[in-house]
């Protein structure tokens, strides 16, 4: 009864430091409450980037100071991470938990490698 | 007596559209004349990007209108491709041929995925 989580292998952040990707899960049950967590793995260290719990059919709400935003549609979550710099390049892993109703399910994607290139500064305007 | 050619799996072009990578070959013989070709594979189409023949110990010379430049050091070739745009993202394959003296050897790398992000235009200076 494993829950499969799929996400793209590679995504490029745009020149404004914004990267978007879809995290899709195959739900073994009829979940009404879902928790999505984005983790970053770099140099064998895993850190939480952001997390949101949402009710199926409702909007995905991250904390106000979160660098993530997202929308949900059925078993798909469209995630956007902003404010990225070149040093944030790394593997971004999507974890999905079906919180309610029981039983609990969890699935972890293989990760999306997000590449970020810092833009050249614009020349000063005289 | 196959000739192994190594190149990095992934390289990011900088914000000026310049990407550099090393193409290294394990020479089965004592070559004096070497030819290096860079090919781009995208949508199962392979096209030649640039090519240069050089004498061992001498400079690597591409044609004047080539988007490639490079230097050689022993069995390593340092390649730089410039003028890249987002649409040029693709797999860049390094092919090395030992032209002289006989026997002829050829080796092809697994390719370097070059990612290119177009920069945001700078605001007009009034």
């Amino acid at each position: 009864k494993a829950m499969h989580v799929a996400q793209p292998a590679v995504v490029l952040a745009n020149s404004r430091g914004i990267a978007s990707f879809v995290c899709e899960y195959a739900s073994p049950g009829k979940a009404t409450e879902v928790r999505v967590t984005v983790l970053r793995q770099a140099d064998s260290q895993v850190t939480e980037v952001c997390a949101a719990t949402y009710m199926m059919g409702n909007e995905l709400t991250f904390l106000d100071d979160s660098i993530c935003t997202g929308t949900s549609s059925g078993n798909q979550v469209n995630l956007t991470i902003q404010g990225l710099r070149a040093m944030d390049t790394g593997l971004y892993i999507c974890k999905v938990e079906l919180m309610y109703p029981p039983p609990y399910y969890m699935g972890i994607g293989n990760g999306t490698q997000i590449y970020v290139i810092d833009p050249e500064p614009c020349p000063d305007s005289d | 007596k196959a000739m192994h050619v190594a190149q990095p799996a992934v390289v990011l072009a900088n914000s000026r559209g310049i990407a550099s990578f090393v193409c290294e070959y394990a020479s089965p013989g004592k070559a004096t004349e070497v030819r290096v070709t860079v090919l781009r594979q995208a949508d199962s189409q392979v096209t030649e990007v640039c090519a240069a023949t050089y004498m061992m110990g001498n400079e690597l010379t591409f044609l004047d209108d080539s988007i490639c430049t490079g230097t050689s050091s022993g069995n390593q070739v340092n390649l730089t491709i410039q003028g890249l745009r987002a649409m040029d993202t693709g797999l860049y394959i390094c092919k090395v041929e030992l032209m002289y003296p006989p026997p002829y050897y050829m080796g092809i790398g697994n390719g370097t995925q070059i990612y290119v992000i177009d920069p945001e235009p700078c605001p007009d200076s009034d």
């Epitope: 009864k1 494993a2 983790l39 895993v46 974890k95 029981p102 039983p103 609990y104 399910y105 972890i108 | -």
Partner: antibody, heavy 121, light 108 residues
Framework: QVQLVESGGGVVQPGRSLRLSCAAS????????MHWVRQAPGKGLEWVAV????????YYADSVKGRFTISRDNSKNTLYLQMNSLRAEDAAVYYC??????????????WGQGTTVTVSS | EIVLTQSPGTLSLSPGERATLSCRAS???????LAWYQQKPGQAPRLLIY???SRATGIPDRFSGSGSGTDFTLTISRLEPEDFAVYYC?????????FGQGTKLEIK
């Protein structure tokens, strides 16, 4: 608070049977998969068996397959391990443990204190 | 069955140091199905990490997990006196749900 209490351990002769019980309290027992894990004196942990939240799926370690049976009674909040044809190598402390999941298993987050089974002639 | 091999067998460190414990699987295990436990003498095991890197409730953030495929790591960033114990990894990728043989973390 959440509690698991094992009972039924004791001294038994090789070839005989024993039934272990695990009483759960402080949780909705019927939501969770349940495991038995054992540990021989001075040895590491050995996973024995698991049963899904509704009792529909059961899995066993190769060393106990065909001899041990895991079961549960959700109306009594109790997990069981029926051990037949006991061998000397079955002697261990037996722990029952609750899984985070119900029929897909991720980790045992609540453990009992263990009950000791001694197999000796 | 999937065999989990933990290394080192014994790790001797001092409080305040960083501990890195390894768990290697004989075949690939999904990150979802890798857990770590701590056991002290005379006590039942305690779940530390599940899903390769998710900390269980009440586990301090000095404990972290990482890895994928066949190689997983438990890191304790700064050892406290109460961290000296035996640590086990376990896989739930395929039945039987095997444990590693354990790593004993002892005071140097």
């Amino acid at each position: 608070q959440v509690q698991l209490v094992e009972s039924g351990g004791g001294v038994v002769q090789p070839g005989r049977s024993l039934r272990l019980s695990c009483a759960a309290s402080g949780l909705t027992f019927s939501y969770y998969g349940m495991h038995w894990v054992r540990q021989a004196p001075g040895k590491g942990l050995e996973w024995v068996a698991v049963i899904s939240y509704d009792g529909s799926n059961k899995y066993y370690a190769d060393s106990v397959k065909g001899r041990f049976t895991i079961s549960r009674d959700n109306s009594k909040n109790t997990l069981y391990l029926q051990m037949n044809s006991l061998r000397a190598e079955d002697a261990a402390v037996y722990y029952c443990a609750k899984d985070l999941g119900g029929d897909d298993y991720y980790g045992m987050d609540v453990w009992g204190q263990g009950t000791t089974v001694t197999v000796s002639s | 069955e999937i065999v989990l091999t933990q290394s080192p067998g014994t790790l001797s460190l001092s409080p305040g140091e960083r501990a890195t414990l390894s768990c290697r699987a004989s075949q690939s295990v999904s990150r979802t199905y890798l857990a770590w436990y701590q056991q002290k003498p005379g006590q039942a095991p305690r779940l530390l990490i599940y899903g390769a890197f998710s900390r269980a409730t009440g586990i301090p953030d000095r404990f972290s997990g990482s890895g994928s495929g066949t190689d997983f790591t438990l890191t304790i960033s700064r050892l406290e006196p109460e961290d000296f114990a035996v640590y086990y990894c376990q896989q739930y990728g395929s039945s039987p749900y095997t444990f590693g043989q354990g790593t004993k973390l002892e005071i140097k």
